[in-house]
């Protein structure tokens, strides 16, 4: 079956500079502002649009060693970012795959909200339930905060 | 046990040049930034700059922009700050510090190179 | 940029007073604040990052609090080894002027 998940989680920073900087320019930000959750991404296959194959080692702070994605689509006008994790202990015995969509929009008040839909697939007849997807969840929500402290610091980049 | 140790005290005359470093250990050093403070005598703590080792990416606090070179070489788990001329205004305590992981508090802390600039 | 500024510079106090020392933000900084204690001659040290997480080993008497561009330092029943200066800082970024705690 397939099991959904949704997560909506505030910003300060503005749309684009937010898309630009976690989405198109994550791989190379999130390691350095968030170092015991991911140590590196670093591109098996592809160059960054879809297709690609991305092998992202957790750090430290992790139960989880690794997890490859592959990359869905990128929608710089729209701040929409698609992919999928294909492997990784991160899926266990339970889960074939999970497709990740992000979309930054404009929050009324100043600054924006990233949503994160989430399609867990299980294997078989296997149940998943919230708890078990919740993880996705908090890790989404500590790198977004990881990142918005850098540009709050360094507001001359990614604008 | 996370560990920074910096380089001994220095005496210079203004004009001079100085590199000063700050040694990391008992961590993955290239991973997490660092940062170097000034605190001059009897005053508060200012952040100069950080560096990332991992790629050598640094970043200067406005006011110290042209004023120090901060530099990194993870191959020896080394950060430095250097001077190409000593001024008077620069003898202070320079600390080096680790930004964790979590938000970036320099959770561990170099014990501070004194450096006196004087003719 | 941002500016930290801190408040009072300087208080005289007893052992076991409550001592409140806050810190503002130019704009807005989340809760993306930590507080340090110096004592003289030592280099800094992290008590609180993140606005109200304490760093590890850090006795619970110190506390923080605040977000957006309010924060408070409190220090529940000041100890001897309390008396030092402190400071908050904006991650990676500036420190406030700093706060003397002196002994009355």
């Known amino acids: 079956g397939v099991f959904n998940y949704e997560v909506e989680t505030p910003s300060v920073i503005p749309a684009a500079r937010l898309f630009k900087s976690y989405v198109l320019d994550g791989d190379k930000l999130i390691p350095k502002v968030a170092p015991q959750a991911i140590t590196s991404v670093e591109n098996v296959e592809g160059n960054g649009g879809p297709g690609t194959i991305k092998n992202i080692t957790f750090g430290e702070g992790s139960r989880y060693k690794y997890v490859k994605e592959r990359v869905d689509e990128v929608d710089n006008t729209n701040f929409t970012y698609s992919y999928t994790v294909i492997e990784g202990d991160v899926l266990g015995d339970k889960l074939e795959k999970v497709c990740h969509e992000l979309k930054i929009v404009a929050a009324p008040g100043g600054g924006s909200i990233l949503k994160i839909s989430s399609k867990f697939h299980a294997k078989g007849d296997h149940e998943i339930n919230a708890e078990e997807m919740k993880g996705a969840k908090e890790m989404a929500e500590k790198l977004l905060r990881a990142v918005e402290t850098y540009l709050l610091a360094h507001s001359a980049e990614y604008n | 046990e996370v560990q920074l140790v910096q380089s001994g005290a220095e005496v210079k005359k203004p004009g001079d040049s100085l590199k000063i470093s700050c040694k990391g250990s008992?961590?993955?050093?290239?991973?997490?930034?660092i940062g170097w403070v000034r605190q001059m005598p009897g005053k508060g703590l200012e952040l100069m700059g950080i560096?990332?080792?991992?790629?050598?990416?640094?970043k200067y606090r406005p006011s110290f922009l042209g004023q120090v070179t901060i530099s990194a070489d993870k191959s020896i788990a080394t950060a430095f700050l250097q001077w190409s001329r000593l001024t008077a205004s620069d003898t202070a305590i320079y600390y080096c510090?680790?930004?964790?992981?979590?938000?970036?508090?320099?959770?561990?802390w170099g014990q501070g190179t004194l450096v006196t600039v004087s003719s | 940029d941002i500016q930290m500024t801190q408040s009072p510079s300087s208080l005289s106090a007893s052992v076991g007073d409550r001592v409140t020392i806050t810190c503002r933000a130019s704009q807005t900084i989340v809760t993306y604040l930590n507080w340090y204690q110096q004592k003289p001659g030592k280099a800094p040290k992290l008590l609180i990052y993140?606005?109200?997480n304490l760093q590890s080993g850090v006795p619970s008497r110190f506390s923080g609090s605040g977000s957006g561009t309010d924060f408070t330092l409190t220090i529940s029943s000041l100890q001897p080894e309390d008396f030092a200066i402190y400071y908050c800082q904006q991650s990676y970024a500036a420190f406030g002027e700093g706060t003397k705690v002196e002994i009355k």
């Open positions: 560096v990332y080792p991992g790629d050598s990416d640094t």
């Open positions: 510090a680790r930004l964790g992981a979590t938000y970036a508090g320099a959770d561990f």
């Open positions: 993140a606005a109200s």
């Open positions: 008992g961590y993955s050093f290239s991973n997490f930034w």
